[in-house]
Amino acid sequence: EEELQVIQPDKSISVAAGESATLHCTVTSLIPVGPIQWFRGAGPGRELIYNQKEGHFPRVTTVSDLTKRNNMDFSIRISNITPADAGTYYCVKFRKGSPDHVEFKSGAGTELSVRAKPSAPVVSGPAARATPQHTVSFTCESHGFSPRDITLKWFKNGNELSDFQTNVDPAGDSVSYSIHSTAKVVLTREDVHSQVICEVAHVTLQGDPLRGTANLSETIRVPPTLEVTQQPVRAENQVNVTCQVRKFYPQRLQLTWLENGNVSRTETASTLTENKDGTYNWMSWLLVNVSAHRDDVKLTCQVEHDGQPAVSKSHDLKVSAHPKEQGSNTAPGPALASAAPL
């Protein structure tokens, strides 16, 4: 009679992570008597996957009923495959022996490759805000994919970026891989509504590439521009001085009026006007009682934006420039009238 052969018909099989893998194995003879065992890998360090006679293998089921007398099909099914299950599986026939069974013949092996989708890309930006014209770095990470081949692209508002570096780890063979990319982005004053997108494409993705996004509103700080102007008002002896705070982001802003260097009033921006580009405008005003001043007055609008050092703009109020016919008199009264923002 011909010697027993162990036949593993599949040289390689590919399985999606989470699915089951069927590893086929048949023998050509019932002789010699002895069990079948499945191993992953070869040599002394091989890993036992299934033992027909003993042991607990919760993820492994046999395709045929091994208790049937003439069974020659020793195929197994491994459930819930993960990338860690990748490798070459050997169906090995043992000859009954005492005290131990003796390895008799091995199949040629079936290589199991596992395809796994990349995780959704996560994009993170710098820890601190930066101002326009500065270059900031964004990182994108995705994990757990196999095979290793993957493409990653960066976009800012739909325009592809070219200044980035990408690494896929590990460099050698592995059960699964991760990708890490860092892109450099130059900020502009119009970037409050901008988005940075990291796009990952992989063979396992049936839809469009996976995308991770970061809103530049979380990264950018647009400092305000200040303008101080004065207009006469109908009431005698009063001048309206306004401080226009324009095109700033984020909203957090505190304004202080100084009269000849002395703090007059501090207020926090509340009712803001939003511009189309996402920045904000705000206006604060003072009613100045000119008659209370003998000398010229230096009015300063000082703005502290988003915890940054204060910026200021001054305006010289010339007392001599207000003759009586323009509403100037020498009656006593408060130098500064209380004023609320418009």
Partner: antibody, heavy 116, light 109 residues
Framework: QSVEESGGRLGTPGTPLTLTCTVS????????MGWFRQAPGKGLEYIGI?????SPYYASWVNGRFTISKTSTTMDLKMNSPTTEDTATYFC?????????????WGPGTLVTVSL | DIVMTQTPSSVEAAVGGTVTIKCQAG??????LAWYQQKPGQRPKLLIY???TLESGVPSRFKGSGSGTDYTLTISDLESADAATYYC???????????FGGGTEVVVK
Amino acid sequence: QSVEESGGRLGTPGTPLTLTCTVSGFSLSSYVMGWFRQAPGKGLEYIGIISSSGSPYYASWVNGRFTISKTSTTMDLKMNSPTTEDTATYFCARVGPLGVDYFNIWGPGTLVTVSL
Amino acid sequence: DIVMTQTPSSVEAAVGGTVTIKCQAGQSINSYLAWYQQKPGQRPKLLIYYASTLESGVPSRFKGSGSGTDYTLTISDLESADAATYYCQSWHYISRSYAFGGGTEVVVK
């Protein structure tokens, strides 16, 4: 699980023609689908695919000659301005469950003849 | 686009014999290569994907191998039912585009 093409007929140059691929046993929202063609006595040629989310991608030679779209149960290939060179059997196919690198379910094809 | 060069364009072999078909990609395709069988008037049938993985239900007489740019389909123990045209098809993971070889007609004597 199967796919089948329809709409093949005798057409005239310049007159738009739309082919339809009808699927059964699976959802178009889960798989990439492709269109291919084979001129008489020639080899297979890739035209384009549409992703599970509905985004079309075309072979570089297409240059607007074809438009791929889909509904919940069918995928269409519109021949925008056919020429006699577009005479071929057109196949639709579904990519494999493991990835988009191969096509494991093909339709029987539908013949388009473009003639003056 | 990647160009796939398939050789030979035609091959003849006897029943029980072996046929080898080669496919060369213009650049590395990282094993993203499939093989199809097509008989006259019929749809293509997937045989092998990812260079060497046998599609379910395909006899183990069909064997795919190769990596990088060079790939091979070997059909052993030829049967008369194997008479057909065989195509290789690549997928390029960067351009995400497909390309076919020119085909090989297998004649079984």
